[in-house]
């Protein structure tokens, strides 16, 4: 249980953000690879791709959504599919790649700040009580941000990306969730891994900015898989 792992600062003190919004398809944030706690399954990397069965979008990586692999296929057989790029057809926001959303059946850019607040974030309620385990369950929640009068600046607390000023997204940062900058070229990013467990991810990063994608750093191929760095690079 959590109490056996967190032996020092009492779990009662854990802020909601530590169980807060994890990145999901269509969201502005990406979870940095965290340490998987006891009881968690190992992440399955995207690099050696295999069909990954799922029941909902949250079980897939941020660059994926959950759906039947064939048009009009059996709804009972769903796998994680690659997200749809800009101008591709869609039926819901989660189908579109990070930085985009589904509008009138087409994936369009959500870089403009007007939409970001409408993107729901997944709240992993792993820390509801003293008996909670690390295998939390998640549900979709639309968080109200009416309490925020002005857009949050870099480092200020937030509930969701719409609370943050333009060029920032709301992402977990150890103790809290704060407004962080959208990533620039060369900055460290997170290559999304499948959510094979609800491991506690204590850092999240925003997505790479326009014209950039998160790819392995060229001079880090010799490093072990678990510690390879990815950076935002030009397409």
């Amino acid at each position: 249980t959590l109490n056996s792992v967190l032996n020092s600062n009492a779990i009662k003190n854990l802020p909601p953000p530590l169980g807060g919004a994890a990145g999901h398809p269509g969201s502005a944030v990406s979870a940095a690879p965290g340490i998987l706690y006891p009881g968690g399954n190992k992440y399955q990397t995207i690099d050696n791709y295999q069909p990954y069965p799922c029941a909902e979008d949250e079980e897939c990586g941020t660059d994926e959504y959950c759906a039947s692999p064939t048009r009009g296929g059996d709804a009972g057989v769903q796998i994680c599919l690659a997200c749809r790029k800009r101008r591709k057809r869609c039926m819901r926001h989660a189908m579109c790649c990070p930085g985009n959303y589904c509008k009138n059946g087409i994936c369009v850019s959500s870089d403009q700040n007007h939409f970001r607040g409408e993107i729901e974030e997944t709240i992993t309620e792993s820390f509801g009580n003293d008996h909670s385990t690390l295998d939390g369950y998640s549900r979709r929640t639309t968080l109200s941000s009416k309490m925020y009068h002005t857009k949050g600046q870099e480092g200020s607390v937030c509930l969701r990306s719409s609370d943050c000023a333009s060029g920032l997204c709301c992402a977990r940062h150890f103790w809290s969730k704060i407004c962080k900058p959208v990533l620039k070229e060369g900055q460290v990013c997170t290559k999304h891994r499948r959510k094979g467990s609800h491991g506690l991810e204590i850092f999240q990063r925003c997505y790479c900015g326009e014209g950039l994608s998160c790819r392995i750093q060229k001079d880090h191929h010799q490093a072990s898989n678990s510690s390879r760095l990815h950076t935002c690079q030009r397409h």
Epitope: S8, I35, E154, W175, S176, V188
Partner: antibody, heavy 113, light 108 residues
């Protein structure tokens, strides 16, 4: 611009108490987590405690747990550190730091001996 | 406990480049790719120079850069200048104790 000014340091006997204050200005104080970090003379930095923007969460280093209490008054833009049962090893400069993306702004510190 | 190990001192000449290392373990630096760096001049408050491995806050010279490989993070200062003479600290977080952790510091 962001400004953090600590006060309340001084000379105190072992076992005594002291309350440090940190006056914040130049930013929306109530929107940021805040921390105390200390530095013993000639030594490195040691994180002491952190408090959430709304005071609902607090965390402490093992070395001060049960003796120090962090608090804040958002209406006064002030951070506090109540230090009880002080020991010789608590001698240090105590810095107030804003915890945005890490410790992004620091005060000049107040010396506790 | 998490401990970040830094060399006690590093030296260089004006115009040169130097690198300061910060070594952790697979369960901290190696595990979640997060480290920050601070500069502290004698008698002054620390200043955040690099966050999240290689990000510079606004106002920090691009002569300062960060990187990480495996369990070791590095701060590189190119084109050394006299005003770079200071103490440098790396910092990460301990997810078990829910605390922030600093390295022992390196005198440049």
């Amino acid at each position: 611009q962001v400004q953090l000014v600590e006060s309340g340091g001084g000379l105190v006997q072992p076992g005594g108490s002291l309350r440090l204050s940190c006056a914040a200005s130049g930013f929306t104080f109530s929107s940021y987590w805040m921390s105390w970090v200390r530095q013993a003379p000639g030594k490195g930095l040691e994180w002491v405690s952190v408090i959430s923007s709304d005071s609902s969460s607090t965390y402490y280093a093992d070395s001060v747990k049960g003796r120090f209490t962090i608090s804040r008054d958002n209406s006064k833009n002030t951070l506090y550190l109540q230090m009880n049962s002080l020991r010789a090893e608590d001698t240090a400069v105590y810095y107030c730091a804003r915890h945005g993306i890490d410790f992004d702004h620091w005060g000049q510190g107040t010396l506790v001996t | 406990d998490i401990a970040l190990t830094q060399p006690a001192s590093v030296s260089g000449s004006p115009g040169q480049s130097i690198t300061i290392s910060c070594t952790g373990t697979s369960s901290d630096l190696g595990g979640y790719n997060y480290v920050s760096w601070y500069q502290q001049h004698p008698g002054k408050a620390p200043k955040l120079m690099i966050y999240d491995v290689n990000n510079r806050p606004s106002g920090v010279s691009n002569r300062f850069s960060g990187s990480k490989s495996g369990n070791t993070a590095s701060l590189t200062i190119s084109g050394l200048q006299a005003e770079d003479e200071a103490d440098y600290y790396c910092q990460t977080y301990d997810q078990i104790k829910l605390s922030a952790v600093f390295g022992g510091g390196t005198k440049l």
